[in-house]
Interface confidence: low
């Protein structure tokens, strides 16, 4: 890959730690001001795989706070609005990072962790098993 | 809300810009190891709105890989395989916490940032604008 | 820490004109929709108009033509332009803003901030 | 526009009571719901939205329920700083639009 130069101006990293332990700035930039508003969306109501989301909070991870798609039906909403069960309702979900307090009630140290969320949901075609 | 007693084990926590420069622990734990597998799924393909998978990478960045979801149609896959205009396909979207090295090209120096993914897609029905 | 202030309100004269501003500090405003919601004197609540982080609007019926909403992103600003005012417009109006949730797509359509609001009486 | 009917209007109650408010919808909102506390001359308070999620810093006595077009905020057990006027709020549509308000009064 690329190596890039060090940066004369970087924390002093002599830690015996490092480079597992790192110095983190909490103050959360944004880097979404330009983004598409759509987010701010109705598409859990909209879908033809519709889902709810559920609160999950943790005071001793950051972000406390994270939400969890879960699909309202089995199968789909058709054009008629009723549920066809020929499709199937699935969850999207991927792996993110968050920071949970360690040793636990720590102000200020955390270790970085990866969960895995469901964002939404989709409409998929369902895997026929045929039996020979 | 619950006042959690402090550790008395924690890190010495006097810097002048705590609380918002924190210790981090790079050693990922993973919470996933019993979730689903489906996670790596074919859903994108066998959705009916389809998306492709787009790379992201950025060396100053941690996780420097990002996984992108952009939509194959602006319509929906139907039950002929064809696209269907009256229902469109869209991004489901998410924020996510990054980190981003601060300074730059520093191994041990971070700043927490938030960024939005496309994770998968949906298929949804279109809001109609009635002209009066 | 999420704040919303509004100014602007006061008299004025049935066919009158008046313009509201709401001062919004503590969140990235541009990303978010904003609301105006208005309350008459020992009535209910009453949402007057949505707008959406690109621009676009929505407008109860009774005030359709006679009001306009917009925004300044770069002021953190957001506007309520009242035209051709009516002694049933009287009410206090409040500038909502939507949850400051970021984790996971949640949606944000509803008001979970407001204003100290600002008193219009519309009065000959 | 899609029309809330909040039941009862006014209702007196005691300390230590358990409280519903019921909000109907004239057709349905499926879960976009949300329940509101006003005191005099204050702004309005978000207590519960989408139907059934506690608003950060609601006390837990508060809980929301329904779905579709009927829907219900419950108080397990009145407290004094709990009488107030509370509304729900639909904004499934536009224009969105809010019940006339049932004020909780003390007995």
């Known amino acids: 890959g690329i190596t890039i130069p060090r940066n004369p101006g970087c924390p002093n990293s002599e830690d015996k730690n490092f480079p597992r332990t790192v110095m983190v700035n909490l103050n959360i930039h944004n880097r979404n001001t330009n983004t598409n508003p759509k987010r701010s969306s109705d598409y859990y109501n909209r879908s033809t795989s519709p889902w709810n989301l559920h609160r999950n909070e943790d005071p001793e991870r950051y972000p406390s706070v994270i939400w969890e798609a879960k699909c309202r039906h089995l199968g789909c909403i058709n054009a008629d609005g009723n549920v066809d069960y020929h499709m199937n309702s699935v969850p999207i979900q991927q792996e993110i990072l968050v920071l949970r307090r360690e040793p636990p009630h720590c102000p200020n140290s955390f270790r970085l962790e990866k969960i895995l969320v469901s964002v939404g949901c989709t409409c998929v075609t369902p895997i026929v098993h045929h039996v020979a | 809300g619950i006042t959690i007693p402090r550790n008395p084990g924690c890190p010495n926590s006097e810097d002048k810009n705590f609380p918002r420069t924190v210790m981090v622990n790079l050693n990922i734990h993973n919470r996933n190891t019993n979730t689903n597998p489906k996670r790596s799924s074919d859903y994108y393909n066998r959705s009916t709105s389809p998306w492709n998978l787009h790379r992201n990478e950025d060396p100053e960045r941690y996780p420097s890989v990002i996984w992108e979801a952009k939509c194959r149609h602006l319509g929906c896959i139907n039950a002929d395989g064809n696209v269907d205009y009256h229902m469109n396909s869209v991004p489901i979207q998410q924020e996510i916490l990054v980190l981003r090295r601060e300074p730059p090209h520093c191994p041990n120096s971070f700043r927490l940032e938030k960024i939005l993914v496309s994770v998968g897609c949906t298929c949804v029905t279109p809001i109609v604008h009635h002209v009066a | 820490e999420v704040q919303l202030v509004e100014s602007g309100g006061g008299l004025v004269q049935p066919g009158g004109s008046l313009r509201l501003s709401c001062a919004a500090s503590g969140f990235p405003f541009s990303d978010y929709s904003m609301a105006w919601v208005r309350q008459a004197p020992g009535k209910g609540l009453e949402w007057v108009a949505t707008?959406?982080?690109?621009?676009?609007?929505y407008y109860r019926d009774s005030v359709k033509g006679r009001f306009t909403i917009s925004r300044d992103n770069a002021k953190n600003s957001l506007y309520l332009q009242m035209n051709s005012l009516r002694a049933e417009d009287t009410a206090v109006y409040y500038c909502?803003?939507?949850?400051?949730?970021?984790?996971?797509?949640?949606?944000?359509?509803?008001?979970?901030?407001w204003g100290q609001g600002t008193l219009v009486t519309v009065s000959s | 526009d899609i029309q809330l009917t909040q039941s009862p209007s006014s209702l007196s109650a005691s300390v230590g009571d358990r409280v519903t408010i019921t909000c109907r919808a004239d057709e349905s909102v499926r879960t976009l719901m949300h329940w509101y506390q006003q005191k005099p001359g204050k702004a309005p308070k978000l207590l519960i939205y989408l139907v059934s999620n506690s608003e950060i810093g609601v006390p837990d006595r508060f809980s929301g329920s329904g779905s579709g077009t009927d829907f219900r905020l419950t108080i397990s057990s009145l407290q004094p700083e709990d009488f107030a006027t509370y509304y729900c709020l639909q904004t499934h549509s536009y224009p969105y639009t809010f019940g006339q308000g049932t004020k909780v009064e003390i007995k």
């Open positions: 707008i959406g982080p690109s621009g676009d609007t």
């Open positions: 909502a803003s939507p949850p400051q949730y970021y984790e996971g797509s949640i949606p944000r359509l509803w008001p979970a901030h």
